[in-house]
Interface confidence: low
């Protein structure tokens, strides 16, 4: 049989070979189609509601005004020609629907190195066959599960078209030190043979390299956090990390109203000075930083101080100042 | 027509406050990340702060880390910078400027907005 | 930080000239160099990206060279609207940025 591929929605014409250019013309099509059940014969006089779908032309040959996915199927054809000679045609018809251009919807503008992202969500529309969606690095194809690559894939079926709507999530995981500006795309390759590849536009999310995180220490002076009514405390807050973050002060967990510095001052210590403090440090890459908690006391006249100042968990981790 | 117009800046003492804002139209804000850039007396240009396009990373220069704050409002196209703790080294014309060439460099740039800190 | 060392701070030029301005980076920066061409009461302008990358609408007689350390901004054909201040950028370590003193052309 002679493989015909035909666009949906397209005019077909299935030539009958042998069959004499006017009539009377002696030959008989026989379709076995998605609209058939086993064989549906035509003949070149036709008439009622297949007109619509397919019909003998006064040449011989078979039109059909419209493919459809239900056309795909076996059209063969018997013909005699004046002499008596008989000759056959077969046809194998495959429909095909090409989709719009792909597209890249939800796609992530920033990544993380280090950790698997989210880089967007390729859908085709209105395929048919199905076709199949790959993902490209750098113009490079992406193989799933490689290299910190996953890919979810969906494909879904229009109830009353028939055509296809294709889904494929893609998560990376970006190498630390990696290409800061990666260029992701994806295509759409068709079912059939011979049709090229559609491809969406780029994106380029750019990738950040998260800041280690480093312990904030706090520092108590004087040690301990015991002093005297009258006396002075130092606090000091410190981060190894470079360039240096923003230092905020907590007092019994709530945020001190103060400018950012990395040294706090409590002069002439009162019973209102009492508590429990921390540091926290927000660096420009990653999420706030709590160090430890340290607890300030008043000794009276006579009191022993403690040797080490009560130290308790944040309890809190990670939080966002008010 | 991309536009991003500065505003906010004025004369403040040393030791104060100002907050800057840069309205954007005319291109997709949410894609590109943002920066401030100042220009002293002298004409020559600072890098102040950047912004990523999602809002998630923020980075400073060494000068004013911890007392510059940049921020952004994607619902309202906006760019902010908060300076406190003012010093007359940051007397300078303030521009907002945008990155969205893969390379980053700053493809628009505002007009400027004016900040002199002195007593 | 990545210093960008202007060395000409001005430089006389005429019309129909070629004017070569360079810009020397403190350590290797690849192709991470953009120009800039600012003019009096404007903001500046984007010329070259990439080191030799001329941006949009940007005329030809504009071209970008170097990579690594030195890099050059080259005026072909000198005109009247090209007298202005340039300054070379590096973003090599981008977010982390920093700028050129700047090159000023003057007529001779």
């Known amino acids: 049989a002679q493989n015909i591929t035909a666009r949906i929605g397209e005019p077909l014409v299935l030539k009958c070979k042998g069959a004499p250019k006017k009539p009377p013309q002696r030959l008989e099509w026989k379709l076995n189609t998605g609209r058939t059940e086993a064989w549906k014969v035509l003949s070149p006089q036709g008439g009622g509601p297949w007109d619509s779908v397919a019909r003998v032309l006064p040449n011989g040959s078979l039109f059909l005004p419209a493919v459809g996915i239900q056309d795909e199927g076996i059209f063969r054809c018997q013909a005699m020609n004046r002499n008596g000679k008989e000759t056959k045609s077969n046809y194998r018809v495959r429909v095909y629907q090409i989709p719009g251009k792909p597209e890249i919807v939800d796609s992530a503008s920033e990544l993380t190195a280090g950790v698997p992202n989210k880089v967007g969500t390729c859908v085709s529309e209105g395929s048919y066959p199905a076709g199949t969606l790959s993902w490209h690095l750098d113009g490079k194809p992406l193989v799933p599960n490689e290299k910190g690559v996953s890919v979810k894939e969906q494909t879904r079926r229009h109830p009353e078209t028939g055509l296809f709507t294709l889904q494929s999530e893609l998560m990376v995981t970006p190498a630390r030190g990696g290409d800061p500006r990666p260029t992701f795309s994806c295509s759409f390759s068709p079912g059939l043979p011979r049709h090229r590849a559609l491809r969406t536009a780029p994106i380029q999310p750019r990738v950040w390299e998260p800041v280690p995180l480093e312990e904030v220490q706090l520092v108590v002076e004087p040690e301990g956090g015991a002093v005297a009514p009258g006396g002075t405390v130092t606090l000091t807050c410190e981060v190894p990390a470079q360039p240096s973050p923003q230092i905020h002060w907590m007092k019994d967990g709530v945020p001190l109203p103060l400018p950012p510095s990395p040294v706090l001052i409590l002069p002439e210590i009162g019973p209102q000075d009492q508590g429990t403090y921390s540091c926290v440090a927000t660096h420009s890459s990653h999420g706030p930083q709590e160090s430890r908690a340290v607890s300030i006391s008043i000794i009276e006249p006579g009191e022993e101080g403690p040797t080490a100042g009560s130290v308790g968990g944040s309890g809190l981790g990670t939080l966002a100042l008010a | 027509e991309v536009k991003l117009v500065e505003s906010g800046g004025g004369l403040v003492k040393p030791g104060g406050s100002l907050k800057l804002s840069c309205a954007a139209s005319g291109f997709a804000f949410s894609s590109y990340d943002m920066s401030w850039v100042r220009q002293t007396p002298e004409k020559r240009l600072e890098w102040v702060a950047t912004?990523?396009?999602?809002?998630?990373?923020?980075s400073y220069p060494d000068s004013v880390q911890g007392r510059f704050t940049i921020s952004r409002d994607n619902a309202r196209n906006t760019l902010y910078l908060q300076m406190s703790s003012l010093r007359s080294e940051d007397t300078a014309l303030y521009y907002c400027?945008?990155?969205?060439?893969?390379?980053?460099?700053?493809?628009?740039w505002g007009q400027g907005t004016s900040v002199t800190v002195s007593s | 930080d990545i210093v960008m060392t202007q060395s000409q701070k001005f430089m006389s030029t005429s019309v129909g000239d070629r004017v070569s301005i360079t810009c020397k980076a403190s350590q290797n920066v690849g192709t991470a160099v953009a120009w800039y061409q600012q003019k009096p009461g404007q903001s500046p302008k984007l010329l070259i990206y990439s080191a030799s990358n001329r941006y949009t609408g940007v005329p030809d007689r504009f071209t970008g060279s170097g990579s690594g350390t030195d890099f050059t901004l080259t005026i072909s054909n000198m005109q009247s609207e090209d007298l202005a201040d340039y300054f070379c950028?590096?973003?090599?370590?981008?977010?982390?940025?920093?700028f050129g003193a700047g090159t000023k052309l003057e007529l001779k």
């Open positions: 950028q590096q973003y090599s370590s981008y977010p982390l940025l920093t």
């Open positions: 400027a945008s990155s969205q060439l893969p390379p980053y460099a700053m493809d628009y």
């Open positions: 912004i990523s396009s999602g809002g998630s990373y923020t």
